[in-house]
């Protein structure tokens, strides 16, 4: 046969699915390979052949759409699954081809067991929401297109394994769970259970999102510099160690990058000869505002060494600090060498 | 210097109604939600309301769901509270407070005192 | 909601003594609770949030330890401006609840 554009396997997209759910997932040529979209290819005479790659195995084989209750089906570029079985789980192929024309990529689907309450393998989306805020929305994820809009699905919300009922700031809301002055103990694990018939069945959808509550943007600022300050010298004497810590508190913003960094008489520290080194370590309080510490350290401390100028720098969006930390030798009066 | 001024209590009937208003200063009131928390006379405190310090957010306790309004005009630096279908339990000293989920309720008013007697 | 419980109702010291008030909450609350001190025809105000750490201007004799449902206030030596009714009050999650109040008055 004639040669096929092959993009591989997708492994960025790692679909994953629960068992005995509904499934639909789109075939990715035309979402992330393809410049046109399914009808124009369709029209154009091409045809979307599915077949797949079961677990632990190398054949190739066709994906068999005559199962009872036509369990799995095509529909245009959609391959659904109603419901999904555990051994469904393999790297699935979608492959447009004419007599002239061929492109197909493989993605894999995993098909992942979860317990009464909502437990498993699979990995959430993360929402993050501002604490104290007026109100936060979140709507039930990746529902779209598994039910016609004359169908009023039902749908129970949860935290863990417990039904949203009298929630005193959380109310659900259809597809939408609101959350009224979120505080930080409304983080956690909220699943939506979409109930929803077809054909004489009903069809339960089970989608989970984790809610972190993190700092206000009202609260973001500049870099805070807690070390080095004013009130602590830093006095040694020539051969001892000299460790300064850089301690910088980051309020939280969004997808903010965080900087901190040492300068000794203005280089960075792989540009001076002075024998450095520097460990950092970050941790982060109940709203993810972050306390930086990078500790400066020379083992053998001589007397140029306490006549430099270390200088802890750091950045975030909001600005930038930087605080000089006062070393000097001890028995020397001064921190300045003296010039005659 | 931050202060909480609390206006507009006094003596109503059961059913009626009364609006409070707390007049604050010397903060940024738009960065900081605001509550109203009430004492019974020789009794202790009962959260009553609050709101973000947006506006959009509000939550009130079960006792007055329903009967009472929280706002706020952060132009004019004050907070209100309408109090509706009052009922006698109801009587008692109203206190705004500023709050913080990192300090909780870090500064207060004087008060002013709700009567609901016929 | 969460049920916070003080302990003792009424405490008896002398000044110059140490006082040790008690507050029980019914779930878990973290660190995020506060103590409140109140005088007769006054306002409450703030001695402690997070469970330990002093609120602006409270004296070092003030101090709170505790987290998850057991918290405890401690005055060193009673003072008599001391003399008051003490309320705690968790503010993990809504509604934010406080404790009956323990008043500590002059033995």
């Known amino acids: 046969s004639e040669r096929c554009d092959d993009w591989g396997l997708d492994t960025m997209r790692q679909i994953q699915v629960f068992e005995d759910e509904p499934a639909r997932i789109k075939c990715p040529l035309f979402e992330h390979f393809l410049k046109y979209n399914y009808s124009t290819a369709h029209s154009s005479g091409l045809t979307l052949i599915w077949y797949w790659t079961r677990q632990d195995r190398d054949l190739e084989e066709p994906i068999n759409f005559r199962l009872p209750e036509n369990r799995i089906s095509k529909e245009k570029d959609v391959l659904w699954f109603r419901p999904t079985l555990l051994n469904d789980t393999g790297n699935y192929t979608c492959m447009l081809r004419n007599t002239t024309y061929c492109s197909k990529v493989a993605f894999p689907l995993e098909v992942v067991q979860k317990d009464s309450c909502f437990n498993s393998a699979m990995r959430f989306p993360v929402h993050k929401m501002y604490i104290e805020h007026g109100i936060h929305k979140i709507t039930c994820p990746n529902v779209d297109g598994y039910f016609p809009s004359s169908v009023k699905p039902s749908v129970t919300w949860y935290k863990g394994c417990t039904e949203i009922v009298d929630f005193h700031n959380v109310l659900p809301e259809g597809m939408n769970l609101s959350f009224f002055i979120p505080l930080v103990s409304n983080n956690g694990n909220y699943t939506c259970v979409v109930t929803y018939p077809e054909n004489g069945r009903l069809f339960h959808l089970t989608r989970t999102v984790t809610v972190k509550v993190v700092g206000s943007p009202k609260d973001a600022l500049p870099p805070q510099i807690y070390s080095p300050n004013d009130r602590v010298v830093y006095e040694k004497e020539p051969g001892e160690e000299l460790v300064i810590p850089c301690k910088v508190y980051f309020s939280f913003i969004m997808d903010s990058h965080n900087e901190v960094w040492w300068t000794i008489d203005g280089k960075k520290p792989d540009d001076v000869t002075v024998d450095i080194t520097i460990n950092e370590s970050v941790s982060y309080s109940s709203t993810e505002d972050e306390t930086r510490t990078q500790i400066l350290s020379i083992k053998k401390v001589t007397p140029e060494d306490l006549r430099r100028n270390y200088v802890c720098h750091a950045r975030n969006t909001k600005g930038e600090a930087e605080q000089a930390a006062k070393v000097k030798q001890k028995g020397n009066g001064c921190t300045e060498p003296m010039t005659l | 210097e931050v202060q909480l001024l609390e206006s507009g209590g006094g003596l109503v009937q059961p059913g009626g109604s009364l609006r409070l208003s707390c007049a604050a200063s010397g903060f940024t009131f738009s960065h900081y939600g605001m509550s109203w928390v009430r004492q019974a006379p020789g009794k202790g405190l009962e959260w009553v309301s609050a709101i973000s310090y947006d506006g959009e957010g509000t939550l009130y306790a079960d006792s007055v769901k329903g009967r009472f309004t929280i706002s706020r005009d952060n132009s004019k630096n004050t907070l209100y509270l309408q109090m509706n279908s009052l009922r006698a339990e109801d009587t008692a000293v109203y206190y705004c407070a500023r709050f913080r989920y990192y300090t909780a309720f870090d500064y207060w008013g004087q008060g002013t005192l709700v009567t609901v007697s016929s | 909601e969460i049920v916070m419980t003080q302990s003792p109702a009424t405490l008896s010291v002398s000044p110059g003594e140490r006082a040790t008030l008690s507050c029980r909450a019914s779930?878990?609350?973290?660190?995020?609770l506060a103590w409140y001190q109140q005088k007769p025809g006054q306002a409450p105000r703030l001695l402690i949030y997070?469970?330990?750490t002093r609120a602006t201007g409270i004296p070092a004799r003030f101090s709170g330890s505790g987290s998850g449902t057991e918290f405890t206030l401690t005055i060193s030596s009673l003072q008599s401006e001391d003399f008051a009714v003490y309320y705690c009050?968790?503010?993990?999650?809504?509604?934010?609840?406080f404790g009956q109040g323990t008043k500590v008055e002059i033995k």
């Open positions: 997070g469970a330990s």
């Open positions: 009050q968790q503010y993990n999650n809504w509604p934010w609840t």
């Open positions: 779930q878990s609350v973290s660190s995020n």
